[in-house]
Structures are given as structure tokens and as C-alpha cells.
């Protein structure tokens, strides 16, 4: 159930197609979980500051059921920073990631859980 | 129904500064939408300039040099290309359209009739 | 920048007649759209996202394609098809048009 949020400053007409798109094969291949278990929230247009500049910046989350940890979370950063600089020009020193891993029980879907 | 109109000076000399303004009626230019300029020269090329979004932001093509800028005035509905020392390359019809969002996609769904820009001394 | 080729510049066909327009692009983009213009007129919206029909576009037109190669396709040509077609794309900055196809009617 992989759900990844970016909360950014640049403007909708900045979003390239297919961004969502890419970012759930990109995701899917990374966590090694099937795409349409993918879930993926851009928000642009944000009134955001990072470091007292309003040049473009993003504030994400990525929340997994496993697949969460040191190592695992450093290639996530890479993967995500280098989309975010490559897509929507966000310089990765402007970017923060944080990572949670949700226990089963506590994620609902479908009616039910994952537990 | 949604219509964009553009206007400007016509006929400018080189070096010259000037402003190419688009009156949109039908749609607000500070709800949901950008708003673009984009040109086609005389051997018919289409280059797309730049936009203001409804929130005011501002997006340039950065292939071309920084010689323009887009503003806007919302108690008018219109928005505004500058353009700064003009040169003859900069003769062009100038467009303003509409950038509506499907999923995952953006595309212009309304532009104007276009304003012709000669650039000659 | 993502440079689009579109072939051919120049086609004619008869009333009738299958059209394929094709467009190029120098790195893969996720999406194609397509524009329509008659002299003296402003392009119009035909079709977004590869494949959908934009308002009021006969049902003949068609879009497809995927990665660098996509393609407009009329099922029967018919004399208000006659236009100049571009291509355009959003998928990388900056948004990038294709040079034009310019469709007769024979």
C-alpha cells in the first residue's frame, strides 16, 4: 500500500504529464509492490517557504507497510529527489522525505485492513 | 463561453519595448487555470513562451532569452506579455490560450484569435 | 528540450481516403496532443492525452501511440479535414510543438 505525498510550490501548469503516471512505476519497482497498490497525491500550488525562500521545494511523505529503513529509505531519497529535479526542477537541498512504516492493522483499504 | 482576446501595438521598431495584452471573458484568470502566451512565426513554428497560473505564478520557456515577462491585472481579467528589446525575430503572431488538466495531463483548450507583431525599423 | 518530427509536412488525399499523421519525438513523453489549424485562424484543441477527442471533433479522427511515436488518424477523409495538424507535448520542459503537417484534400 505504498502512498507517497508531495506537497510542493510549483504551479500545476509546471506538472508535466504523466507525472503521476511515472511516479507509481517508479514507486512500484522501488518497494518491489505491485502498481496497483500505488498510491500517489501531488499537491502543487502551495504556499511553501523552505530555508525562508519561496524558489521551488517539496515536503513529502512516503508511508509502506515494511519496506521502510536506513538503507532502503536512502535509495528511496535518490529516486525521488532525482524525479522531483528532473520533472518539476526542484533542487534536491530543497526537498524533504519523511518515511513511515505503518503496521498492518492500523491501514485500512477495502472495507477491512491488511492485517 | 470562454474567449480570450488578444491586443498590441502592431508594428514596433527594434530595440523597442512593448506590451501584448489578453482580455478573457467567460472564465476568471484567478480560478483553476493557466494562462499562456505562445507565438507562431511566419513559417508557421509554434514556441511556446510561458504562463501566469491563477495563483499568480509565473513559468518561462528557459530555452529563450529572459527578455519577456508575464504579469496580470484581475480586476480586468487580463493578462500581459512584456517584451523587451524587441529584434525583427521577435515578429510573430502572438497567442494567448487556456491550460485546462485532465488526469495526469494538461493541454490548451481556448486560444485567441492572435495579434500580429511586425518588428521593423 | 524534446524535439518533435512530424511527417509527413505535406500529404494530400481524396475525399474518402484513410489519413495517418505521424509525430516523432527525440526522447519518449508520455502524452501527445494535437491541434488543428485553418489559414487565418487560430489552432484548436482535436486531440489530448493521445487519444481523446476534444469537443465537437468528428468520430472519425483518431490518436495513438506511445514513448517517441504517435499518430493522428482521420478514417475517411473528408474536405473540412484540410488544415495544417501539430503536435505538442508536455511531458518534459519546455513544452515543445512539432513543425506542422499540412493536409489537402485531392
Known amino acids: 500500500m505504498p502512498m507517497f505525498i508531495v506537497n510542493t510550490n510549483v504551479p500545476r501548469a509546471s506538472v508535466p504529464d504523466g507525472f503521476l503516471s511515472e511516479l507509481t512505476q517508479q514507486l512500484a519497482q522501488a518497494t518491489g509492490k505491485p502498481p496497483q497498490y500505488i498510491a500517489v497525491h501531488v499537491v502543487p500550488d502551495q504556499l511553501m517557504a523552505f530555508g525562508g525562500s519561496s524558489e521551488p521545494c517539496a515536503l513529502c511523505s512516503l508511508h509502506s507497510i515494511g519496506k521502510i529503513g536506513g538503507a532502503q529509505n536512502r535509495s528511496y531519497s535518490k529516486l525521488l529527489c532525482g524525479l522531483l529535479a528532473e520533472r518539476l526542477r526542484i533542487s534536491p537541498d530543497r526537498v524533504y522525505i519523511n518515511y513511515y512504516d505503518m503496521n498492518a492493522a492500523n491501514v485500512g483499504w477495502n472495507n477491512s485492513t491488511f492485517a | 463561453d470562454v474567449q480570450l482576446q488578444e491586443s498590441g501595438p502592431g508594428l514596433v521598431k527594434p530595440s523597442q519595448s512593448l506590451s501584448l495584452t489578453c482580455t478573457v471573458t467567460g472564465s476568471s484568470i484567478t480560478s483553476d487555470y493557466a494562462w499562456h502566451w505562445i507565438r507562431q512565426f511566419p513559417g508557421n513554428k509554434l514556441e511556446w513562451m510561458g504562463y501566469?497560473?491563477?495563483?499568480?505564478?509565473?513559468g518561462y520557456n528557459p530555452s529563450l532569452k529572459s527578455r519577456f515577462s508575464i504579469t496580470r491585472d484581475t480586476s480586468k481579467n487580463q493578462f500581459f506579455l512584456q517584451l523587451n528589446s524587441v529584434t525583427t525575430e521577435d515578429t510573430a503572431t502572438y497567442y494567448c490560450?487556456?491550460?485546462?488538466?485532465?488526469?495526469?495531463?494538461?493541454?490548451?483548450?481556448?486560444w485567441g484569435q492572435g495579434t500580429t507583431l511586425t518588428v521593423s525599423s | 528540450q524534446i524535439v518533435l518530427t512530424q511527417s509527413p509536412a505535406i500529404m494530400s488525399a481524396f475525399p474518402g481516403e484513410k489519413v495517418t499523421i505521424t509525430c516523432s519525438a527525440s526522447?519518449?513523453?508520455?502524452?501527445m496532443h494535437w491541434f488543428q489549424q485553418k489559414p487565418g485562424t487560430s489552432p484548436k484543441l482535436w486531440i489530448y492525452?493521445?487519444?481523446n477527442l476534444a469537443s465537437g471533433v468528428p468520430v472519425r479522427f483518431s490518436g495513438s501511440g506511445s514513448g517517441t511515436s504517435y499518430s493522428l488518424t482521420i478514417s475517411r477523409m473528408e474536405a473540412e479535414d484540410a488544415a495544417t495538424y501539430y503536435c505538442?507535448?508536455?511531458?518534459?520542459?519546455?513544452?515543445?510543438f512539432g513543425g506542422g503537417t499540412k493536409l489537402e484534400i485531392k
Open positions: 526522447s519518449s513523453v508520455s502524452y
Open positions: 490560450a487556456r491550460e485546462a488538466y485532465g488526469y495526469d495531463v494538461g493541454y490548451f483548450d481556448y
Open positions: 505538442q507535448q508536455r511531458s518534459s520542459y519546455p513544452w515543445t
Open positions: 492525452g493521445t487519444s
Open positions: 501566469i497560473s491563477f495563483s499568480g505564478s509565473t
